[in-house]
């Protein structure tokens, strides 16, 4: 899977979308997990409703919410009041029994609030040692696409 980058502003909300084939993943609950290290496990943050039929209901765990459009095939995660410590690598997952299939790998970046003049030294960006060569950036800040930029994130 390629990694898709979503950028949000500290203190604001960030919405992450994970498209999927609704027929392929029919009846399957979804989850949002945080990758612990490059090869480490993915720690569950929040999952959709226990009853798949009710997956459209938003479920919260702390400041993170998840909702699933099972017909349209879009999983949406909302990170409310984004903080520097929220930055990192995540996954959208489709659950099947004890299995979890990766729908999308997501890199969350937290940008400094331009109205906040405090030291931005604790804001996290991927270091040079971390490889996200194929990453595609999706800004939560509205802007027009640059020439030649892909309008829709690549999926594999």
């Amino acid at each position: 899977h390629n990694t898709t980058v979503f950028q949000g502003v500290a203190g604001q909300s960030l919405q992450v979308s994970c498209p999927y084939d609704s027929m392929k993943h029919w009846g399957r609950r979804k989850a949002w997990c945080r990758q612990l290290g490059e090869k480490g496990p993915c720690q569950r943050v929040v999952s959709t409703h226990n009853l798949w039929l009710l997956s459209f209901l938003r479920r919260w765990n702390g400041s993170t919410a998840i909702t699933d459009d099972t017909l349209g095939g879009t999983l949406t995660i909302t990170l409310r009041n984004l903080q520097p410590h929220d930055a990192g690598l995540y996954q959208c997952q489709s659950l099947h029994g004890s299995e979890a299939d990766t729908l999308r790998k997501v890199l969350v970046e937290v940008l400094a609030d331009p109205l906040d003049h405090r030291d931005a030294g604790d804001l996290w960006f991927p270091g040079e040692s971390e490889s996200f060569e194929d990453a595609h950036v999706e800004h939560s800040i509205s802007r027009s696409l640059l020439e030649g930029e892909i309008p829709f994130p690549p999926t594999s």
Partner: antibody, heavy 126, light 107 residues
């Protein structure tokens, strides 16, 4: 009406390979997981693996990794299973079966097998 | 992998009798279990899905119950059409597995 039509019986030599087919009709072939099941003479059912024709994604029973290769051709709505390095242990009837999938709008997985092919007998003999 | 233990392996019964087949799974599969009937030389046919629901066209003399790790299939007033083999099957994640089967033979 959903139908799964499998290819005819095969007599193959030990060490050879065989490719059997399952032609689907009566539904959107790309949108449903297709499984393959093995049944040795007088024995029970064994799940080999499954393929999602929409994108070619496959899942295998570890026991059949390297033995079975699942493919699908969307243009002809046909699923295939190739069995390699055949031995007498591979002599069996092989069924293709389609999951219920999105025909069921309930609160559980819909991965039971609602539709089955008629079976293909593979005999491995010198 | 989830193991499935089906019992009895075979049963010699007469028309009109009541039969119960059980299936035990090594892990909780919730209600993600199906039952199939197979006649000699034929493909399996779906009898029960999601642990307790009868498939279309299945006679009401069949009933199924259970959840988690213990499941059963009951046939009341056995008919001649009911002889054959029965298999349970879990679909709680891959690899899917089947029970070893129960063969119903005429006494």
């Amino acid at each position: 009406e959903v139908q799964l039509q499998q290819s005819g019986a095969e007599l193959v030599k030990p060490g050879a390979s065989v490719k059997i087919s399952c032609k689907a009709s009566g539904y959107a072939f790309s949108n449903y997981w297709m499984s393959w099941v093995k049944q040795r003479p007088g024995k029970g059912l064994e799940w080999i693996g499954q393929i999602y024709p929409g994108d070619g994604d496959t899942k295998y029973n570890g026991k059949f990794e390297g033995k079975a290769t699942l493919t699908a051709d969307k243009s002809s709505s046909t699923a295939y299973m190739q069995l390699s390095s055949l031995t007498s242990e591979d002599s069996a009837v092989y069924f293709c079966s389609r999951e219920k999938g999105a025909d069921y709008y309930g609160s559980t997985y819909s991965a039971w097998f609602s539709y089955w092919g008629q079976g293909t007998l593979v005999t491995v003999s010198a | 992998d989830i193991q499935m233990t089906q019992s009895p392996a075979s049963l010699s019964v007469s028309v009109g009798e009541t039969v119960t087949i059980t299936c035990r799974t090594s892990e909780n599969v919730y209600s993600n279990l199906a039952w199939y009937q197979q006649k000699q030389g034929k493909s399996p046919q779906l009898l029960v899905y999601a642990a307790t629901n009868l498939a279309d066209g299945v006679p009401s003399r069949f009933s199924a119950s259970g959840s988690a790790t213990q499941f059963s299939l009951k046939i009341n007033s056995l008919q001649s059409a009911d002889f054959g083999s029965y298999y349970c099957h879990h679909f709680w994640g891959t690899p899917y597995t089947f029970g070893g089967g129960t063969k119903l033979e005429m006494n």
